[in-house]
Interface confidence: low
């Protein structure tokens, strides 16, 4: 570590004396320290002689010797007190730029350590301390505010009292810097824009950050557009913003328009697309298939998208029938906004019952006209079976009516014994009716079919059974000859 | 001229609900800079800033009322409405909206109610 | 909150006074601070935007002064049309916040 002469930490002298410093080390050793008038160098090998004939109070100051080939990096230091009656303070920087939180020193020494006790920090023109302002005093490095604010960017002046009245420094400018966490933040409004032409329409695009420095363009497709800026200070935050105003638009300002803000940080951009129609539209479309089908009892929503400009004047849900003459109630009915042309509209059908199947139609209206969209709401039900016996070309025959919807599958049974259902172990012959006859199909409504069994002789303690079944459900009826020789004739005319 | 003009019911109940609508003139809520507040006088007491709403629709709330109150904007119709639920009979004030100045950037962000209603006196009693 | 306390909470004088009132704000609010006159069954008015600033068509009678947390309304020459009360408006920080007013009454 290199050595100092005089061997004292400090060194307090008048204006005009002669001031010498040695520094001796190991190697080649150099001087560091504040930049100061009459101050001459002589270096001999492991020696260095700082000297001057005149000094004065900007000499004052930390005068550090290094030996640049120690790797430890050993140094020492004398601090010199040019003590002026007239000048109580040495500025070595007028300006001192941080960034905020950052400790901001603000370099004014004092010349004579024995006014240390009546230093202080001021706003120009003597005006206090901002409140909050956290601050400490070296007389060797002057004032530092610990943690400096962006609001504390203000001139300042070092105060001493010297006999009875305050000296103060020259002004010392602190610009406390904001830590740009990234580009500006960015709107572009509106996000999608539709006009047709002629009309007028208004694109902004703003940008704001914590710093006023920073730029902001608008380009349609890729073109800068030449905008006037306004400019603003709001919540803490500086913002620009360009305001497009096309008064008739034509294709040609359709496009792609940019919002493009940039600072020291980078680039952040954001797009919207501006469609120029030449008239009114309305287009109405669902994901849905337009046919449903729906067990009976179950829930069901039908949705509606709807692409529009210039907005919808009126829109609504009908039913059209067939069956009883209700209309779909308000609170069932949803409208939601996507974004400023797309609307999704549903209507919730929870639990249906027989008489709400049928069409409903979505109708929706804007300056194109109406337009509208209907839905096919079938119903499902599980088979309803019935049996009769009767005879047919005087034959006695059993007839099976299955109604239910999808059309319902017929499948005779024949057990043993009297039972409500033939069970496995009870089977004793099975038929199929592959085609039953259809009595009636109507749309929306139950498909009713007929499946005939012919029996010459209705056998006594046995079950005959009609089961039909669809893809909702089964139903079955269970019949019973009451006595054997009672239905083997017709019945009297 | 810059005109505001304050509309609601005289009257409400405990625990209802009061909307108040601010209709101006002689501005535009879209111009850049320019804000709409609320601010409420109870008998006999100080003045008591509840909302500003801003021409980029930014809202500010008494945090003291903050759960109870919304303050929305119409540019279209030039009107700006407060709501303010669960009123009390404390909430009985002359309730008045106020333009705020637009901004004159860069010297300073001036923020101030330069024009005035005439305020409207809701009284909340059973 | 920034609280804002007012003084006097009233005051008489005469005609022809001069009256001063403060506000003092629990923070420094960096001059953003406003005084309205208010009537009763009338709207307030601005007088002073930013502690100093006179507001356009009020009488040169009426100034603001201060900084930090310390702020004035001077009316150098009460006249019989300033009998009001008057309250100031921090707008520096949200909550914005009015004092508690000062009443000023015929001695």
């Known amino acids: 570590i290199p050595v100092i002469e005089p061997s004292v930490p400090e060194l307090v002298v008048k204006p005009g004396a002669t001031v010498t410093l040695r520094c001796v080390g190991n190697g080649s050793v150099e001087w560091d320290g504040p930049p100061s008038p009459h101050w001459t160098l002589y270096s001999d090998g492991s020696s260095s002689i700082l000297s001057t004939n005149n000094a004065t109070f900007q000499n004052t100051g930390t005068y550090r010797c290094t030996e640049p080939g120690d790797p430890l990096g050993g140094s020492a230091a004398i601090h010199l007190y040019v003590k002026d009656p007239a000048r109580p303070w040495n500025v070595l920087a007028q300006e001192v730029v941080v960034f905020e939180d950052q400790d901001a020193l603000l370099p004014c020494l004092l010349t004579d350590p024995v006014l240390e006790a009546g230093v202080s920090l001021v706003r120009v023109r003597g005006r206090p301390l901002m409140r909050h302002t956290n601050y400490s005093f070296s007389p060797w490095h002057g004032f530092t505010i610990h943690r400096a604010k962006f609001i504390q960017s203000q001139d300042y002046q070092c105060s001493a009292l010297m006999g009875g009245r305050k000296v103060m420094s020259i002004s010392i400018r602190l610009k406390v810097q904001k830590v740009i966490p990234g580009p500006p933040a960015l709107t572009l409004v509106p996000a999608e824009l539709v006009r047709i032409r002629g009309e007028a329409a208004q694109i902004v695009c703003s940008a704001s950050s914590v710093d006023v420095n920073f730029d902001v363009f608008l380009q349609h497709n890729n073109t800068k557009l030449a905008i006037p800026q306004q400019s603003d200070f709001h919540n803490n935050r500086y913002q620009k913003v360009l305001t497009l105003n096309l008064d008739q638009v034509d294709f040609q300002h359709a496009g792609n328009y940019s919002c493009v803000a940039s600072n020291v940080q980078g680039k952040h951009s954001t797009s919207m697309f501006f469609r120029v129609v030449e008239s009114a539209y309305l287009n109405l479309s669902s994901e849905q298939n337009l046919i449903q089908e729906v067990t009976v009892g179950e829930g069901l929503n039908l949705k509606v998208m709807v692409e529009a400009y210039p907005g919808l004047q009126g829109f609504n849900w009908t039913y059209l029938g067939p069956f009883s003459d209700h209309q779909p109630e308000p609170k069932l009915a949803n409208a939601t906004t996507k974004d400023t042309y797309r609307h999704t509209f549903t209507l919730s059908l929870p639990r249906l019952k027989p008489s709400e199947a049928g069409r409903y139609s979505f109708l929706a209206r804007n300056p194109g006209g109406w337009r509208a969209l209907t839905f096919e709401l079938t119903l499902r039900y599980p088979p309803e079976v019935s049996v009769i016996w009767t005879f047919i070309n005087g034959s006695g025959t059993l007839l099976c009516a299955a109604s239910g919807y999808p059309q319902p599958n017929v499948t005779w049974l024949q057990c043993s014994g009297h039972t409500d259902r033939c069970d496995e172990a009870q089977v004793l012959q099975v038929w199929d009716d592959p085609y039953p006859e259809v009595l009636s199909q109507e749309p929306f409504h139950k498909v009713t079919v007929q499946s005939l069994l012919t029996v010459e002789t209705l056998e006594h303690n046995q079950t005959y059974e009609c089961r039909a079944h669809n893809s909702v459900g089964s139903g079955s009826w269970a019949f019973i000859p009451i006595s054997a020789g009672a239905h083997t004739h017709p019945p009297d005319e | 001229e810059v005109t505001l003009k304050e509309s609601g019911p005289a009257l409400v109940k405990p625990t209802q609900t009061l909307t108040l609508t601010c209709t101006f003139s002689g501005f535009s809520l879209t111009t850049y800079g320019m804000g709409v507040g609320w601010i409420r006088q109870p008998p006999g007491k100080a003045l008591e800033w509840l909302a500003n709403?801003?021409?980029?629709?930014?809202?500010y709330y008494n945090p003291s009322l903050k759960n109870r109150l919304t303050i929305s904007k119409d540019t279209s119709k030039n009107q700006v409405v407060l709501t303010m639920t669960n009123m009390d009979p404390v909430d009985t004030a002359t309730y008045y909206c106020?333009?705020?100045?637009?901004?004159?950037?860069?010297?300073?962000?001036?923020?101030?109610?330069?024009?005035w209603g005439q305020g409207t006196m809701v009284t909340v009693s059973s | 909150d920034i609280q804002m306390t007012q003084s006097p909470s009233s005051l008489s004088a005469s005609v022809g006074d001069r009256v001063t009132i403060t506000c003092l704000a629990s923070e420094d609010i960096y001059d953003n601070l406003a005084w309205y006159q208010k009537k009763p069954g009338k709207a307030p008015k601005l007088l002073i935007y930013y502690a100093s600033s006179l507001q356009d068509g009020v009488p040169s009678r009426f100034s603001g002064s201060g900084s930090g947390t310390d702020y004035t309304l001077t009316i150098s020459s009460l006249q019989p049309e300033d009998f009001a009360t008057y309250y100031c408006l921090q707008d520096s920080e949200y909550p914005w916040t009015f004092g508690g007013g000062t009443k000023v009454e015929i001695k």
């Open positions: 709403i801003w021409w980029d629709d930014d809202k």
């Open positions: 106020a333009r705020i100045g637009p901004i004159k950037y860069p010297t300073a962000p001036y923020r101030y109610f330069d024009f």
